[in-house]
Structure formats: structure tokens, C-alpha cells
């Protein structure tokens, strides 16, 4: 069905950097629990990358639940890391430098570096490719610059820019993507396409969770991650079913193809699930 893959067509072109979290529980879905109370709580939404309100039933649920917006932000957003890194004598390490290395929940293992607060050095570990926390750097140098002390006991570099909350880079903050979609499929569908380390050029498909489509990419033949499919159909089968389009204030988003819609009630909002 050639139109199948054109189902979700309207979304911003903004590509988000990989999401890194302070705590893995910030990635849990909002869970109202089995009880019937109506309690206003907050959770961190990994798709909007913001703390949002939800209705909690009063029992069970998970750790991604906070009494206040402030508490949620403190635990799950990096607003407090977006301060200017202090210069010279006033310099401090960002608090994420003290977090334990976290491989995350995916299994597309790649080399990353973390600051080991015990040895006071940046060290190598294997990152699974998604989630985890911000004590996670693509290069040893980046890790050293941000977390290690220089010879006189302060940071190696003096940065006059803000620390990017999402990808640890010292750049202006990225633009936010409207919260149009939710994803409830396998976690690796959220990982970026990864060519891997070899030299082949194999035609593969990966699920682009930003636009909700399977897209072609060139695979090197080794390494990479699990967001890697030999056909578009296989990619859609694995990842598309978890892709849910949310109602926005402007009503239901138009799609290229009309389909029967089945209404589902979930906690605090209504969503439409396409019959696949």
C-alpha cells in the first residue's frame, strides 16, 4: 500500500538532537494507575521535552509523577543546566557531571564518555543509543572540557555560552517541536539512523520519529543500532503501530488519507488511533 507511508505528513522539519535525560524514569509514560481519584500531577513528556499536567488516580503508577511543575522540572529538565557556566575561580561543574553513567534502555551500543566523579576523570562506556542522562559525551575532549578540573582546580575552558540541555553541546538552545505526536512502540524506533562503522553502502530504512515515517538511509554493513530495516514494510510494521497522532487545539490534524477512526480515552486527553 503505497499511501500507507504517507499517513503522517504535516509536521515541522525541525530535527531534534538525541534526548538525554537526567533520570531514566523521566522517560516513563504518564501512568494514572488503577485507582479512581482525580489528582493533578505532572510528568515529563519525552516528545515535547517539557513537564506537563496529567490526572493521577491516586495509587501505583510510576516515578514519572510529580506534585508540582517545579519538582518535575528540577528532576527531568535541564533548565537549571542552562545557566552560564561560571568562569575562572567561580566555575563549577554542571550537576549532571555527578550522575552515574547510564546506558539507557536501547541496545544500539556505541562508545560514549562520562565523568567518573570517583576517579575525577572522563572515562569510556557503552551507551545504548537512547535516553540515559546528560553525563554522556560524544568525545573525551567534550567530557573533559565540561566536567574535568583543569590544573588549577577549575574547569578546562571558560565558556560564555549556554549549555544546551538536550545534547550537551555549547550552542544556542534548539527550537521546540509542537507536541503533535505520541509514541508507544519499541524504544529503538526513537533512535536516530546510524550508518555504523564499516564501508558498505547498503540500502536500509529507519523510522524517523520526528516526522512519523520510514525513511531510507545508507547502512555501512556493521554496527549501528536496531532502528535498521531491510524494507520499508518491515520498518512500518515494527514502528508505525506505536505512532499516535494527538488532538491539538485546532482539532484533528489532516492526513493524506482518510481512515476510520477509533476513539480512545486516555487519562487526561482524547487521542485518535488509526486502524492500521
Amino acid at each position: 500500500d503505497s499511501e500507507e507511508d504517507e499517513e503522517h505528513t504535516i509536521i515541522t522539519d525541525t530535527e531534534l538532537p538525541p534526548l538525554k535525560l537526567m533520570h531514566s524514569f523521566c522517560a516513563f509514560k504518564a501512568d494514572d494507575g488503577p485507582c479512581k481519584a482525580i489528582m493533578k500531577r505532572f510528568f515529563f513528556n519525552i516528545f515535547t521535552r517539557q513537564c506537563e499536567e496529567f490526572i493521577y488516580g491516586g495509587c501505583e503508577g510510576n516515578q514519572n509523577r510529580f506534585e508540582s511543575l517545579e519538582e518535575c522540572k528540577k528532576m527531568c529538565t535541564r533548565d537549571n543546566a542552562n545557566r552560564i557556566i561560571k568562569t575562572t575561580l567561580q566555575q563549577e561543574k554542571p550537576d549532571f557531571c555527578f550522575l552515574e553513567e547510564d546506558p539507557g534502555i536501547c541496545r544500539g551500543y556505541i562508545t560514549r564518555y562520562f565523568y567518573n566523579n570517583q576517579t575525577k576523570q572522563c572515562e569510556r562506556f557503552k551507551y545504548g543509543g537512547c535516553l540515559g542522562n546528560m553525563n554522556n559525551f560524544e568525545t573525551l575532549e567534550e567530557c573533559k572540557n565540561i566536567c574535568e578540573d583543569g590544573p588549577n582546580g577549575f574547569q578546562v575552558d571558560n565558556y560564555g555560552t549556554q549549555l544546551n540541555a538536550v545534547n550537551n553541546s555549547l550552542t544556542p538552545q534548539s527550537t521546540k517541536v509542537p507536541s503533535l505526536f505520541e509514541f508507544h512502540g519499541p524504544s529503538w524506533c526513537l533512535t536516530p539512523a546510524d550508518r555504523g562503522l564499516c564501508r558498505a553502502n547498503e540500502n536500509r530504512f529507519y523510522y524517523n520519529s520526528v516526522i512519523g515515517k520510514c525513511r531510507p538511509f545508507k547502512y555501512s554493513g556493521c554496527g549501528g543500532n536496531e532502528n535498521n530495516f531491510t524494507s520499508k514494510q518491515e520498518c512500518l510494521r515494527a514502528c508505525k503501530k506505536g505512532f499516535i497522532q494527538r488532538i491539538s487545539k485546532g482539532g484533528l490534524i489532516k492526513t493524506k488519507r482518510k481512515r476510520k477512526k477509533q476513539r480512545v480515552k486516555i487519562a487526561y486527553e482524547e487521542i485518535f488511533v488509526k486502524n492500521m
Epitope: E100, E101, Y109, I110, T111, N116, Q118, T119
Partner: antibody
């Protein structure tokens, strides 16, 4: 001197459980990720599991995922491997190993033998 | 998973003579950080493994300089310039570039 001493091995029936321990000394245990590697009789080495410095996160080989649980107690300088639903193919000498700052195994214990047989 | 293949599996050598062990990986061991995490272990009879060489050619402390490691990409070699009696045992190459870590089958070095 870095020392790793494994214990807890023995004979167990298929489907049974066993808990291995590794006592570490001679280094700051909490500074290092730790691993278990096994060696079946007369065979080569197979990586089993790794745990991060603080013990919050773990890695497992597909062959043991869901059956084995690695854990650590930094206050006691100890590493553990809880092995459930044991199979004949789990029979091996189990070594604990320290991961250095390059995430490479640099020191190994003397091993403890686990035999799974009816 | 990355397959590590060692040759030969058995290596009878004369004391004082050189020895060479080859290790090939099914994919490149050059990591994205530019390092190659290829390592060699020595396991003497009845003992636990001991790390000899890491990152292709770096000798662990206390390892005699008659041991040298070389290679890149997928082809690696461990050389002993002059074999001594204490070198008897099984030598394993293993890779720490890709997860899971994988080991070669081992090469048994014995005196002729």
C-alpha cells in the same frame, strides 16, 4: 594489589539457582564498572554481564538475559551474579573482572566453577 | 556479534624462538573515537586470565617487552620475540569496540 576473589560456585540441577559473589580489594571498588565472564570446560571465554560504577545500570549477554542478574554492594566491595533457571550450557568457570577507564577488562579473579547437571 | 578468529589454535614452539599468533575480526575494530579496542589475554595452565596487551599494542605493567601487539582494522598479531618456559599457556584476543565483548577461540602455546 588488586584482588578479586569469586565464591558461591557448585553443583546445581537444571532449573535451579545459584548466587555467585566476588570480593574486591586493593582498589576503590565503587570507581569501576565490573563484569562477569565465563569459560565452559575446555572452551573459550564468553562475556556474561557488566554493571556500572554505582550499580544502577546493567548489560547482559543474550544467552543469559532474563535469567541472570548482576548486582553490586559498594559498601561491601562486592559484586554478585544471581543465576536462575540454570541450564547445562551454563556450566563453566565464572570469573569476575574489573573494567578500566577505557571500559576494558584489566584484572580478573581466579574463578569459581558452576556445574549444572542432573 | 563480532566474530574473532585466531590462528593457529595450537602453536608448538622451541624455547628462545619467536612465535606469532594471528587474530582476525569479522568487522573493523576501529571505534568512533578513533581507537581500536583489541586486547590480548594470557591464561597459564590452571590460572585465571591475565591481560597482556590492550589497545592493540599497549603492554600492561609487568609484561615483558618480548611481547608485542600490532595490527589495525580487522587483522591483528601477537608476537613473542623469544619464547620462554613461563610463556606456555593459552592466548586469547578479544575486542572491546563493539558490544557485546567477544573473544577468539584461544591459541595454545606449548614447548616442542
Amino acid at each position: 594489589e588488586v584482588q578479586l576473589v569469586e565464591s558461591g560456585g557448585g553443583l546445581v540441577k537444571p532449573g535451579g539457582s545459584l548466587r555467585l559473589s566476588c570480593a574486591a580489594s586493593g582498589f576503590t571498588f565503587s570507581s569501576y564498572a565490573m563484569s562477569w565472564v565465563r569459560q565452559a570446560p575446555g572452551k573459550g571465554l564468553e562475556w556474561v554481564s557488566t554493571i556500572t560504577t554505582g550499580g544502577s545500570y546493567t548489560y547482559y549477554a543474550d544467552s543469559v538475559q532474563g535469567r541472570f542478574t548482576i548486582s553490586r554492594d559498594n559498601a561491601k566491595n562486592s559484586l554478585y551474579l544471581q543465576m536462575n533457571s540454570l541450564r547445562a550450557e551454563d556450566t563453566a568457570v565464572y570469573y569476575c573482572a574489573r573494567q578500566d577507564g577505557q571500559f576494558l577488562m584489566d584484572y580478573w579473579g581466579q574463578g569459581t566453577l558452576v556445574t549444572v547437571s542432573s | 556479534d563480532v566474530v574473532m578468529t585466531q590462528t593457529p589454535l595450537s602453536l608448538p614452539v622451541t624455547l628462545g624462538q619467536p612465535a606469532s599468533i594471528s587474530c582476525k575480526s569479522s568487522q573493523s575494530l576501529l571505534d568512533i573515537d578513533g581507537k581500536t579496542y583489541l586486547n590480548w589475554l594470557q591464561q597459564r595452565p590452571g590460572q585465571s586470565p591475565k591481560r597482556l596487551i590492550y589497545l592493540v599494542s599497549k603492554l600492561d605493567s609487568g609484561v615483558p617487552d618480548r611481547f608485542t601487539g600490532s595490527g589495525s582494522g580487522t587483522d591483528f598479531t601477537l608476537k613473542i620475540s623469544r619464547v620462554e618456559a613461563e610463556d606456555v599457556g593459552v592466548y586469547y584476543c578479544w575486542q572491546g569496540t563493539h558490544f557485546p565483548f567477544t573473544f577468539g577461540q584461544g591459541t595454545k602455546v606449548e614447548i616442542k
